[in-house]
Interface confidence: low
């Protein structure tokens, strides 16, 4: 669910959203660190219905979600796979 990408491409995100996306609507999250041609960190959320949203890295909800996913990925707990975007 949580993926970090280093890419030679420039910034991917033209517009960022801070609107909350429930986790069960999310297929995976890409984190593009600052550098490699882009001056800012980018977070790309891939929804289960195949749409893609760029999320503001400063949005509190995405920071909390990533922290939860990091903790779970470092433990034995499986991370739920949300295949459909529903509450």
């Amino acid at each position: 669910v949580l993926e970090v990408y280093y890419t030679s491409l420039r910034c991917r995100c033209v517009q960022e959203s801070s609107v909350f996306i429930p986790r069960r609507f999310i297929d995976r999250i890409q984190i593009l660190p600052r550098g490699n041609g882009c001056p800012r960190k980018e977070i790309i959320v891939w929804k289960k219905n195949k749409s893609i949203v760029c999320v503001d890295p400063q949005a509190e909800w995405i920071q909390r979600m990533m922290e939860v996913l990091r903790k779970r990925s470092s433990s034995t707990l499986p991370v739920p796979v949300f295949k459909r975007k529903i509450p």
Epitope: P78, F82, R84, P87
Partner: antibody, heavy 122, light 106 residues
Framework: HVTLRESGPGVLQPSKTLSLTCSFS??????????VSWIRQSSGMSLEWLAA???????YYNPSLESRLTVSRDISDTQVFLRITSVDVADTATYYC??????????????WGQGVSVTVSS | DIKMTQSPSFLSASVGDRVTINCKAS??????LNWYQQKFGEAPRLLIY???NLQTGIPSRFSGSGSGTDFTLTISSLQPEDVATYFC????????FGSGTKLEIN
Amino acid sequence: HVTLRESGPGVLQPSKTLSLTCSFSGFSLSTSAMVVSWIRQSSGMSLEWLAAIDWEGDKYYNPSLESRLTVSRDISDTQVFLRITSVDVADTATYYCAVMSSADSHSVLDAWGQGVSVTVSS
Amino acid sequence: DIKMTQSPSFLSASVGDRVTINCKASQNIHNYLNWYQQKFGEAPRLLIYNTNNLQTGIPSRFSGSGSGTDFTLTISSLQPEDVATYFCLQHSSSLTFGSGTKLEIN
């Protein structure tokens, strides 16, 4: 005050297409980070989630019924629709629409319509 | 699909009794479980969301517990107005409901 009201044909014949409407007020689907779902309940007790549409217009379906379902909303942001093709007697049920309000850490089905009864019969 | 197994399907208890209803998920759903009450002829009403959070306006005699695959709804002191059917709902992956528990007063 959030209210939802379902409407439909009441009775229709097998193999036809069922069209349902959910009319709502008290919230804006397009701006409130909300999701409207369709759920049905057969004559027993079971509840079955069918489909949903969210504030961005994204659509979601129950995988087991996906090929027969189409969910949509109107541009005036006061109605959500569900179409079920090739209906069968097994589609006889009470159909509910429900709104899910998204909060920072969860999403909850927090308001339901009263439901509309649909009978499929020849 | 995640399957929710709810038990018992029928429950008869006395006013004042402590009542428990169980839901078991076919796989780990973490805390993504809600409980609903449905009275005859009415739409379901949310009681508990995300395992143990009491929905606004719901009496404190209702509580929820559990995690992972096993969850419980508890009514600490059964009241006549609690006669209804109770459903669990998992919202970890898509949405699936339990089969319901019909609660009556004996």
